[in-house]
Interface confidence: low
């Protein structure tokens, strides 16, 4: 999916108001310095591409993020503010239902969510500092 035509300010607002807090809740008890950020993004569409990938694509050692509160809210924000996004996710959703639903918060998942926090911070980078 090409995220170029999303309403970035609306997605930013959704992140600031709720998704960010859910990410913090998920990471509670983890030191902010525990994981190094190894994933980055270089513009807003690119950030959303990486955020979608880390949030919804199962990876080795962490297959359970898609059911988390921050993930569901992320999916809702993308569906609302990115034209045509919902249609591209139908097949992905069907595949997701076939995976195990057992929820396990592994260290790998914590590391992955730490990367997500970094990507979201990059997405929300201010244009200019406030005077």
């Amino acid at each position: 999916y090409d995220f170029t035509n999303c309403d970035f300010e609306k997605i930013k607002a959704a992140y600031l108001s709720t998704i960010s807090k859910d990410l913090i809740t998920y990471m509670s008890g983890t030191k902010s310095t525990e994981f190094n950020n190894t994933v980055s993004c270089s513009n807003r569409p690119h950030c959303l591409t990486e955020i979608q990938s880390l949030t919804f694509n199962p990876t080795a050692g962490c297959a359970s993020l898609a059911k988390e509160m921050f993930a569901m809210k992320t999916k809702a924000a993308l569906a609302i503010w990115c034209p045509g996004y919902s249609e591209t996710q139908i097949n992905a959703t069907q595949a997701m239902k076939k995976r195990r639903k057992r929820k396990v918060t592994t260290n790998k998942c914590l590391e992955q969510v730490s990367q997500l926090q970094g990507l979201w911070r990059r997405f929300n980078r201010p244009l200019l500092k406030q005077q």
Epitope: T4, C41, S42, N43, R44, P45, H46, R125, L127, L128, K129, Q130, Q131
Partner: antibody, heavy 122, light 108 residues
Framework: QMQLVESGGGVVQPGRSLTLSCAAS????????MHWVRQAPGKGLEWVGV????????HYADSVKGRFTITRDNSKNTLNLQMNSLRAEDTAVYYC???????????????WGQGTMVTVSS | SYVLTQPPSVSVAPGETATITCGGA??????VHWYQQKPGQAPVLVIY???DRPSRIPERFSGSNIGNTATLTISDVEAGDEADYYC???????????FGGGTKLTVL
């Protein structure tokens, strides 16, 4: 590894044209804004211009506006600088530079090529 | 257009702290980046967004930006730090990128 390699430099007469190229590798070229920065012999750095990550916009320093044109081919990971009506004061090392693209924002130049020398002389 | 002013040169003994300034009108309201350039080499980013450090840059390098002056500080200076240092900002009024004139750091 991430790399930018410039080519096309050389000696050219005043008023003539020259095209510099930059080959990018090791990173997602199509997601980055790309700049040209130059440095005259013994002088400081001077920003030349930028092209947005998707090629939709370009911006130039006043000193080269109307004479220089930046283009890119994201399918080939290449950046070009077309320099017309060259002047002696355009003599410099030209660097191809990468910067994250945030829609006209103040991002740092986080990856530089090794530079290519352009000499404008009769 | 926006102007950045740097001292042409700064000298410091090994092990001491070097301070390089970059002056500009209300520069504290802008994001400042610093580059190191050694003779015959391309510049390297050493500080971005006023005070952030790329992962490969030693902790000895730090930055600050307030009021009309941005500052690059290099503590426990080594001979290998000898180079030209440039500050840079984005001028949003003209949509151009501006470099300071550069400061030559000499390690005595």
């Amino acid at each position: 590894q991430m790399q930018l390699v410039e080519s096309g430099g050389g000696v050219v007469q005043p008023g003539r044209s020259l095209t510099l190229s930059c080959a990018a590798s090791g990173f997602a070229f199509r997601t980055y804004g790309m700049h040209w920065v130059r440095q005259a012999p013994g002088k400081g750095l001077e920003w030349v211009g930028v092209i947005w990550y998707d090629g939709s916009a370009t911006h130039y320093a006043d000193s080269v506006k109307g004479r220089f044109t930046i283009t890119r081919d994201n399918s080939k990971n290449t950046l070009n600088l077309q320099m017309n009506s060259l002047r002696a004061e355009d003599t410099a090392v030209y660097y191809c530079v990468r910067a994250p693209q945030w829609y006209l924002t103040a991002e740092a130049f986080d990856l530089w090529g090794q530079g290519t020398m352009v000499t404008v002389s009769s | 257009s926006y102007v950045l002013t740097q001292p042409p040169s700064v000298s410091v003994a090994p092990g001491e702290t070097a301070t390089i300034t970059c002056g500009g009108a209300l520069i504290g309201s802008r994001l400042v980046h610093w580059y190191q350039q050694k003779p015959g080499q391309a510049p390297v980013l050493v500080i971005y967004d006023d005070s952030d450090r790329p992962s490969r840059i030693p902790e000895r390098f730090s930055g600050s930006n307030i009021g009309n002056t941005a500052t690059l500080t290099i503590s426990d200076v080594e001979a290998g730090d000898e180079a030209d240092y440039y500050c840079q900002v984005w001028d949003h009024s003209s949509n151009t990128y501006v470099f300071g004139g550069g400061t030559k750091l000499t390690v005595l």
